[in-house]
């Protein structure tokens, strides 16, 4: 089929990082600067995608492959292909329409990204809490009081306090 | 033509100021966030500050809190950067550009050409 189609299609004879050219003859032509195509027998190339303002180039553009891009510091990649750079926040924090905002008492996130989700709740698993959450962390849970050995005590603190002079959003 | 155009930029003493504006021409402003951004010479893009359309602020670069404030006028269709207590490494090229809102930019955002600011005694 392959052998087929080439003799009734010149174009499929040409590769990756060319393409068939109508004005002279059909003749497989080069990409032009800025422009590629990833798949052979194409009629034309594609112009490459150009990574300015806050998205960065991670990889160029090459003949046969278009350009990667990322975003600048402070920002991560969101969509397909990175379509969109959105603000990074502090650990502790997790983005709101009105920009970043602390994790409310009870909920942490350790990372740059995302939403602050509740510690855990070391008790539905029948054990105690080992360290306090913070906004940044999540609880530690230790063994339940029934693992320890004789004469152990469990190391649960009291419920922690409100931070000074932070509010719950 | 829809285009941003800052200008305000030049040479400073450390420790002076400068205003920069940023003016739309053929979109409304007050539909957009405005956010400033800078580069210098051979470092990285960095967000500086943005305001939104309803006037809400974010600080993008923790090194200007305190010094750097923004504002718009709606009327005039410009934003404004008032950058205070400038240092020599706050010499860059700056850019505006127009997000719908200040957490999430894309490739089709309009940039302006930048204003260089040099911090120099």
């Known amino acids: 089929f392959e052998r087929t189609r080439s003799l009734q299609d010149p174009c499929s004879n040409c590769p990756a990082g060319t393409f068939c050219d109508n004005n002279r003859n059909q003749i497989c032509s080069p990409c032009p600067p800025n422009s590629f195509s990833s798949a052979g027998g194409q009629r034309t190339c594609d112009i490459c995608r150009q990574c300015k303002g806050v998205f960065r180039t991670r990889k160029e553009c090459s003949s046969t492959s278009n350009a990667e891009c990322d975003c600048t510091p402070g920002f991560h990649c969101l969509g397909a292909g990175c379509s969109m750079c959105e603000q990074d926040c502090k650990q502790g924090q997790e983005l709101t329409k009105k920009g970043c905002k602390d994790c409310c008492f009870g909920t942490f996130n350790d990372q740059k990204r995302g939403i602050c989700r509740p510690w855990t709740n070391c008790s539905l698993d029948g054990k105690s809490v080992l360290v306090n959450g913070t906004k940044e962390r999540d609880v530690v849970c230790g063994p339940s009081p029934a693992d320890l050995s004789p004469g152990a005590s469990s190391v649960t603190p009291p419920a922690p306090a409100r931070e000074p002079g932070h509010s719950p959003q | 033509q829809l285009q941003l155009v800052e200008s305000g930029g030049g040479l400073v003493q450390p420790g002076g100021s400068l205003r920069l504006s940023c003016a739309a021409s053929?979109?409304?402003?007050?539909?957009?966030?405005i956010g400033w951004f800078r580069q210098a010479p051979g470092k990285e893009r960095e967000g500086v500050l943005c305001?939104?359309?309803?006037?809400?602020?974010?600080i993008y670069a923790d090194s200007v809190k305190g010094r750097f404030t923004i504002s718009r006028d709606n009327a005039k269709n410009t934003v404004y950067l008032q950058m205070n207590s400038l240092k020599p490494e706050d010499t860059a090229v700056y850019y505006c550009?127009?997000?719908?809102?200040?957490?999430?930019?894309?490739?089709?955002?309009?940039w302006g050409q930048g204003t260089q600011v040099t911090v120099s005694s």
């Open positions: 053929g979109f409304t402003l007050a539909d957009y966030a």
């Open positions: 550009v127009a997000p719908r809102i200040c957490s999430t930019y894309s490739s089709d955002d309009y």
């Open positions: 305001i939104s359309s309803s006037g809400d602020v974010t």
